[in-house]
């Protein structure tokens, strides 16, 4: 069976074939080539010399136990290697040679049981190193690690390794890798020689599931003192086993290290008192908290020295009380527990994002719903009711608003967002508003996006309401029940590139309300239910227009509409997907593909 | 299309068949099996992805006695720090996992279940397999 | 299962009117588009009307401008047709259609009514 052209010339899909050695029916430019799922079984020198362009190998679960010296010899250009799952037994020292420009090895689950005997020292341009899941059972990284000096990825996570001792790092002191990110999660760690990690820098630490009790954890993260650490996560997976206790004196430790972002990633337990638990957290940058419980939410409102807080995936028993001067970023999504929204006090409050959690808000918005006059970046998607009972007073900084899919009210009954005058982005899609207001978008003067898919219009028809969104590049009007649209709607969008139009129940195409769109560049009417033209005549749509969208409309293809046809015919280098332009009538030419018509007035008669 | 045995609890009998063409081997373990009334225990997999499950995703599409509920989705894997281990698994990485399940209270009435899980992962989104469940409920009391 | 009966057919002298009638059961489709599309004998079934939701939209097939009119009931659930000056072409079986609620057109269809126009 052959393998599968996704890219002529450049990638090929040969996964599963039941190859027993490499395919020599490839062309020589090939840069992409996966191989895996199949028994290669063993990589002799210049396996791959007929790919010289090669700049990604994947031999993923190949069988592979021996790989010679050379076996890549001829692939300077490869930067991704992947050996995922292959139980190699005999790997020769000259296995990786020749990869002069590889960035990223992939060796999970290879049965790799020292990084000592690894033979990748010579990998200069080396940046990211997986090892995971395989039988490392000590972290030395031996001396070879001095010349990876562009490495910024490290995965030893799900192998053997107990302890960390000072000299294990050692390398680390000769050459600061300054950007290494380093993953030991599924260690089952149970001890760290204290000055192991002092003075030594990493971007990022992960240690999730490494403690298999409260006092190991404890004694570990004392034995991290003196790390400097960009960002640190901690934590527990679901699906592993968990810690029986957890309280403060866990994290004390902490306070011995630098930590500009900290993160806590799961946790089997109930957090009860937070200022206790993050005493030494309080002055990083940005503090992160993923899936977990959180019993009194009155905490937050401590005086603690976050710029960014991140509540993510957490059960709380109420919406928290929120007080932090010096926050500006606040990211709080698809949590449960509190539906209500309550105000917060965040004076310096510049991002909001309260996405995907069930919220309902009495009122909204003003200033003194977040208590900050800096918010630029407010999020409402996914969530409950949201009664607009007020037009955004104080937040007049907004340049980036989305409600979508939540369940939006009074929309319609006064310019709501009349004081936004910086807004460059709106997205009311899925609200259940219903426009039957035309000042609905007054004040929106630099408005370029906006998105409002799947609402509805009173009776159906588009009136003049975009008339001040004169920097309109993006509009979506698309799954709006649209039938009508007054010719004017568009006469002030002389900036507008993209207009979706699908979806709705449009009878017939008509270029005329198209004609001041001098910027238009993608037309979309896809989804529509176009029959015919609205006059017997067709304008041509403006010179800008490079792709016109009619698939999947009920095109009438009798003798007619044979000038509608034949105009169609004469836009054909405009349109898109042209095979999914298909007569709906009469039942005889149903399906048929309209360009492929011979429009003579034989058709019918 | 061959049935695939899970076990038989004291009011329910759980199978599957696979509902696509590729039909990579995929072991399910249920342990105790699943009592529909009340439940507790431990769901055990042993699985080889053909691709990797970072952002792992389900449709599920639930029938009961023929009438379709509507499709649900459930975010497995969110793509970093997820809740669970397995999300970190790369393509032709051996997974070996145990997950702990727990429910109570649900009401059922006597009947044959059907769900389709679709299991989507990856960048670009592809289908990583597709499982038909059937769930044949006697309950002992109703 | 959405069901559509057609009733108002019958045998006309040219220059007459019929007035077509369509009830859907079954589901209501206040929200879809629906139609009338007709068979003349030994040609191919072609739409005739079709009304959109709210009644904003129409179409007809160029035969019959001006002399039918399609309108809807949506309390009722119901389509009309109603058809003047008719003419022996326009003589055929008269079929009311449906959109489905999820957009699909034309997806459900009434057996059709007879209509017969004789000079």
């Known amino acids: 069976e052959p393998c599968v052209e996704v890219v002529p010339n450049i990638t090929y899909q040969c996964m599963e074939l039941n190859f027993y050695k490499i395919p020599d029916n490839l062309p020589f430019s090939t840069k992409n080539l996966d191989l895996s799922f199949n028994p290669l079984r063993h990589l002799g020198s210049y396996s791959f010399f007929s790919f010289p362009e090669l700049q990604v190998l994947d031999l993923s679960r190949c069988e592979i136990q021996t790989i010679e010296d050379g076996a890549y010899q001829s692939l300077s250009h490869l930067s991704t290697l992947i050996l995922t799952g292959n139980p190699i037994q005999s790997l020769a020292l000259g296995a990786f040679s020749g990869l002069s420009s590889l960035q990223k090895l992939v060796a999970v689950e290879t049965n790799l049981a020292s990084l000592e005997n690894f033979p990748i020292g010579h990998l200069k341009t080396l940046k990211e190193l997986n090892v995971a899941h395989n039988l490392i059972q000590s972290f030395k990284l031996p001396e070879y690690f001095s010349n990876l000096t562009n490495l910024e990825h490290l995965d030893l996570s799900s192998n053997k390794i107990q302890s960390i001792y000072c000299t294990d790092l050692r390398v680390l002191h000769q050459m600061p890798l300054l950007n290494l990110s380093l993953d030991l999660s599924l260690n089952p760690m149970n001890f760290i020689q204290p000055g192991a990690f002092k003075e030594i820098r990493l971007h990022k630490l992960t240690l999730r599931n490494n403690f298999d009790s409260l006092n190991v954890m404890k004694t570990c993260i004392q034995g991290l003192a003196g790390l400097e650490v960009h960002r640190l996560v901690l934590g527990e997976f679901r699906n592993e086993g968990n810690l029986e206790k957890f309280d403060k004196s866990a994290l004390e430790g902490l306070c011995n290290l630098t930590i500009e972002e900290f993160r806590l990633a799961y946790l089997d337990y109930y957090l009860d008192d937070i200022i206790d638990l993050f005493n030494c957290l309080t002055n990083v940058s940005s503090f992160s908290l993923v899936s977990v419980t959180i019993e009194r939410v009155k905490d937050f409102s401590y005086n603690f020295g976050w710029q960014h807080l991140e509540l993510v995936n957490c059960k709380f028993g109420q919406f928290p009380t929120l007080k932090l001067k010096s926050l500006k970023r606040l990211t709080f999504t698809s949590n449960k527990g509190g539906n209500a929204f309550s105000e917060v006090d965040l004076p310096s409050l510049e991002f909001l994002d309260l996405s995907r959690n069930g919220l309902s808000f009495k009122g909204c918005c003003s200033q003194s719903d977040f208590g900050t006059t800096s918010l630029k970046y407010l999020d409402l998607s996914f969530n409950g009711v949201i009664t607009m009972s007020s037009n955004f007073l104080g937040l007049e900084q907004l340049e980036h608003l989305d409600f979508q899919h939540s369940n939006l009210k009074q929309m319609s009954e006064f310019s709501v967002f009349l004081s936004l005058r910086n807004l460059i982005y709106l997205d009311i899609s899925h609200t259940h508003t219903r426009v039957a207001f035309n000042g609905i978008f007054n004040g929106l003067s630099s408005l370029e996006v906006l998105k409002m898919a799947g609402n509805s219009f009173q009776e159906n028809f588009l009136p003049d309401i975009f008339t001040e969104l004169r920097n309109l590049t993006f509009l979506d009007l698309s799954q709006c029940q649209l039938e009508q649209l007054s010719p004017t709607a568009f006469n002030s969008l002389s900036s507008l590139q993209v207009l979706n139009m699908s979806h709705n129940n449009f009878f017939s195409l008509d270029t005329f309300p198209y004609k001041c769109l001098n910027s238009l560049q993608v037309l979309d009417y896809s989804l529509n239910h176009i029959m015919t033209s609205k006059k017997q005549e067709l304008q041509h749509f403006p010179s800008s227009l490079a792709f016109l969208n009619l698939t999947q409309n009920d095109f009438a293809c009798t003798c007619e509409h044979q000038s509608f046809l034949q105009w169609i015919k004469d836009q054909r280098q405009l349109l898109v997907e042209v095979e999914r332009m298909e007569c709906a009538t009469p039942s005889d030419k149903q399906g048929m593909p309209v360009l492929s018509l011979n429009i003579t007035c034989q058709m019918n008669k | 299309q061959k049935q695939y045995w899970v076990c038989n609890s004291s009011d329910a009998s759980i199978s599957y068949t696979y509902c696509d063409k590729m039909q990579y081997p995929i072991s399910i373990n249920v342990n105790p099996c699943i009592e529909l009334k009340r439940s507790k225990g431990l769901l055990h997999i042993f699985y080889i992805p053909r691709r990797d499950l970072k952002q792992l995703y389900f449709n599920l599409y639930i029938t009961v006695n023929t009438m379709n509920l509507p499709k649900r989705k459930e975010v497995i894997c969110r793509g970093s720090d997820d809740d669970y281990s397995f999300c970190r698994a790369l393509k032709g990485e051996t997974v070996n996992t145990t997950i702990s399940f727990s429910f109570k209270g649900i009401k059922f009435s006597k009947g044959k279940y059907k769900c389709v899980v679709e299991a989507i992962s990856g960048s670009p989104e592809e289908m990583l397999f597709c499982l038909e469940f059937v769930i044949l409920h006697q309950p002992n009391s109703n | 299962e959405v069901q559509l009966v057609e009733s108002g057919g019958g045998l006309v002298q040219a220059g007459g009117s019929l007035r077509l009638s369509c009830v859907a059961s079954g589901r209501t489709l206040s929200s879809v588009n629906m139609g009338w599309f007709r068979q003349a004998p030994g040609k191919e079934r072609d739409i005739v009307a079709r009304?959109?939701?709210?009644?904003?939209?129409?179409y007809y097939a160029e035969s019959v401008k001006g002399r039918f009119t399609i309108s809807r009931d949506n309390a009722k659930n119901t389509v009309y047709l109603q058809m003047n000056s008719l003419r022996p072409e326009d003589t055929g079986v008269y079929y009311c259609?449906?959109?489905?609620?999820?957009?699909?057109?034309?997806?459900?269809w009434g057996q059709g009514t007879q209509v017969t126009v004789s000079s």
């Open positions: 259609v449906a959109d489905s609620p999820g957009g699909r057109s034309y997806e459900y």
């Open positions: 009304i959109s939701p709210s009644s904003v939209s129409t």
